[in-house]
């Protein structure tokens, strides 16, 4: 038998420095977690203790803090090289700055293979990107070889900016021939490493013949066997075992997100490359693990450029600003309310006596809210904090839509509710009631909108044929997160101001904020 140790991360989202327990900015260093310096300590410890070790990343290193805002991916290449990652799969966020923003800082600089079997380049891009990412890579590990085959969410064109010259194929359809090729080449230990979410990870384990292990990302899934060490609630045991269609037991793993844990999986293979056993658990990278001094010094060196960028206080919050995915992708969250209020405030234009304002409504995809802000830092809010909440560098735009389009959008918001997907809408100037016991496409049972042609604003039922103005992120206006109906049916689209600037201006204007959860989004069951 031959034993392999797989160390893995996913959805690190620019958390190069240690963070607080909820993955926002580190306030009390003695209680902080993660960061590349601490990760390196643990990785090196395991490399010294065990013979056959692979360090893998399942995508979405890009996007999430000021590090990415300033360094645009150069920081990812530099520190992943320093940690000596063995391979990485492309995530959807690796395309946030377009293909060029992936090629120049990362693909050309990485000293490790970057993988995706289901992304195919066409047109002029094909020759430009050739060899810079691979469908698979065979790696030497001790006296053996291991094949790593990559995959990326086929939803990427809806979630990021890959452009028109990359085709995202079905993961299973694309993976099978590559795995078959590896088998033909007598590579009998194969890891699928990718970024399509836990459900797809499990499907790959079930359907792709020849895959021995699946290391995933995208859904921030936390798996754990035994008593979990922090706040994350396990979605299942680690590893999660899937019985494949050809009768094999295939371990599937993921390691939450934000560099808080290091996935640790030990696999035992027989001489024919079959998995005999698998066990492990994510390792919580808490303050009991020291930060590596050399990596930490390098972080501090790179940090200087960031410190000049955005550390002045904009205003204060006296409440916790809940921007967690656990809240904002499932229910009304006060961070969503704050952002929507800022978006409306930024568009106050009293140009007609008949209207208190020309627009009263805001919608905001919950997946676009990327971090909470803790009020226990003297209440201070900085540009840097906001860059972690709204890291995508988008704009808040003005559109005109028919009521019927808005109704479709709100149905889409909850069509697959419960899977922590980003399309769940946060709102302003809208009261919506969902009944999740009804079938998808028929779950919106009440949709009231704030009048504009009125002296005392009040909520009236949405009219299907009426045209409404709505403020929303450009991401939604462009059909992101599956909101194709907005892109296809909008009657007018005017580009707006930078998202972080809109919120920072609002906070500066208000000086002290205290947004609440106030019943904008409700759930009910039964007759209406």
């Amino acid at each position: 038998a031959w034993e392999l140790t797989i160390l893995h991360t996913n959805d690190v989202h620019s958390r190069l420095e240690q963070t607080s327990e909820d993955s926002s900015k580190c306030v009390n260093a003695s209680r902080c977690m993660g960061g590349v310096a601490r990760l390196f300590t643990k990785v090196q410890q395991i490399r010294r203790a065990e013979p056959n070790v692979l360090l893998l990343d399942a995508g979405d290193q890009y996007q999430g803090t000021i590090w990415f805002t300033v360094y645009k991916g150069a920081e990812v290449a530099h520190f992943m090289n320093a940690l000596r990652y063995d391979a990485m799969a492309l995530g959807n966020h690796e395309f946030d700055n377009g293909v060029e923003g992936l090629i120049e800082p990362l693909l050309k600089e990485a000293k490790f293979p970057i993988l995706s079997a289901n992304i195919k380049a066409k047109g002029p891009l094909a020759s430009q990107i050739s060899g810079l990412y691979l469908p698979y890579k065979v790696l030497p590990v001790g006296d053996e070889v291991v094949g790593i085959v990559g995959y990326t969410s086929k939803e990427t064109p809806f979630l990021s900016n890959p452009g028109t010259n990359l085709v995202f194929e079905d993961e299973i359809t694309a993976l099978q021939p590559e795995v078959d090729k590896l088998k033909t080449l007598n590579v009998n230990k194969i890891i699928a490493l990718g970024h399509s979410g836990f459900e797809m990870d499990k499907l790959i384990a079930q359907k792709v013949r020849g895959v021995d292990v699946v290391v995933g990302g995208h859904s921030n899934t936390f798996l754990y066997t035994g008593n979990p060490p922090s706040k994350e609630v396990p979605a299942g045991k680690y590893p999660f075992i899937v019985t494949s269609d050809d009768g094999r037991k295939v371990p599937v793993v993921q390691a939450y997100a934000f560099g808080k844990y290091l996935g640790y999986l030990k696999i035992e293979f027989d001489e024919r490359g079959n998995v005999i056993s698998s066990h492990g658990n994510p390792i919580l990278l808490n303050s009991s693990i020291p930060e590596d001094p050399s990596i930490k010094a390098d972080i501090n060196k790179w940090r200087i450029k960031l410190d000049n960028y955005s550390t002045q206080e904009l205003g204060k919050t006296i409440v916790y600003l809940d921007g967690s995915s656990q809240s904002c992708r499932f229910r009304e969250c006060n961070m969503g309310n704050l952002i929507c209020d800022a978006m409306i405030n930024n568009n106050l234009r009293h140009t007609d006596e008949m209207f208190w304002n020309h627009v009263s409504m805001c919608i905001l995809n919950g997946g676009g809210i990327r971090s909470p802000i803790d009020e226990r830092n003297n209440g201070t809010i900085t540009w840097e904090n906001l860059a972690a909440v709204l890291p995508f560098g988008g704009t808040f735009d003005l559109v005109q839509l028919k009521g019927s389009t808005l109704k479709k959008a709100f149905e889409h918001s909850v069509h697959r509710y419960g899977q922590s997907t980003g399309e769940f809408l946060q709102v302003g100037g809208i009261h919506v009631v969902y009944d999740l016991s009804r079938k998808p496409g028929d779950r919106v049972v009440k949709l009231d909108v704030l009048c504009t042609k009125c002296r005392v604003p009040s909520y009236d039922p949405l009219k299907m044929d009426e045209v409404y103005k709505v403020i929303l992120p450009n991401f939604l206006a462009n059909g992101g997160d599956g909101f194709q109906m907005i892109k296809d049916e909008l009657l007018r689209h005017d580009s707006g101001d930078q998202d972080i600037n809109v919120v920072s201006t609002y906070i500066s204007k208000m000086k002290v904020i205290y947004p609440a959860v106030e019943g904008r989004i409700k759930f009910s069951t039964g007759s209406h």
């Epitope: 000293k111 060899g131 691979l134 890579k137 065979v138 030497p140 070889v145 080449l185 007598n186 590579v187």
Partner: nanobody, 128 residues
Framework: QRQLVESGGGLVQPGGSLRLSCAAS????????IGWFRQAPGKEREGVSC????????YYADSVKGRFTISRDNAKNTVYLQMNSLKPEDTAVYFC?????????????????????WGQGTQVTVST
């Protein structure tokens, strides 16, 4: 068992020629990118020349361009390195390496990424 076996090394005078062979057993070389690497005493291993399996594209290090030629005979499952106009600085142990991954010949030769299969090497000495 997969093996790469180099042969053809030896002692040669400056300006002379040698032809190195890399024979594979246990796998078909036509599916692999193959590279010749060398390591001189006290120096790092460097890529000399690489050839792909599919389109037979080639790559040469600047130091050997115009003097060395890489070729492959898939029927014999062998890759060759014809070395002409040899110089004393070509003295090194020459290794053959193979990668079934679809890496470019340049990425293989640099090498950008770890290469899975290596031979034991053959000594080439260029001296009067």
């Amino acid at each position: 068992q997969r093996q790469l076996v180099e042969s053809g090394g030896g002692l040669v005078q400056p300006g002379g020629s040698l032809r190195l062979s890399c024979a594979a057993s246990g796998f078909l070389l036509d599916y692999y990118v193959i590279g010749w690497f060398r390591q001189a005493p006290g120096k790092e291993r460097e890529g000399v020349s690489c050839i792909s399996g599919s389109d037979r594209s080639t790559y040469y290090a600047d130091s050997v361009k115009g003097r060395f030629t890489i070729s492959r005979d898939n029927a014999k499952n062998t890759v060759y390195l014809q070395m002409n106009s040899l110089k004393p600085e070509d003295t090194a142990v020459y290794f053959c390496a193979a990668d079934p991954s679809p890496v470019t010949v340049q990425a293989m030769c640099l090498p950008r990424f770890p290469v899975p299969y290596w031979g034991q090497g053959t000594q080439v000495t260029v001296s009067t």
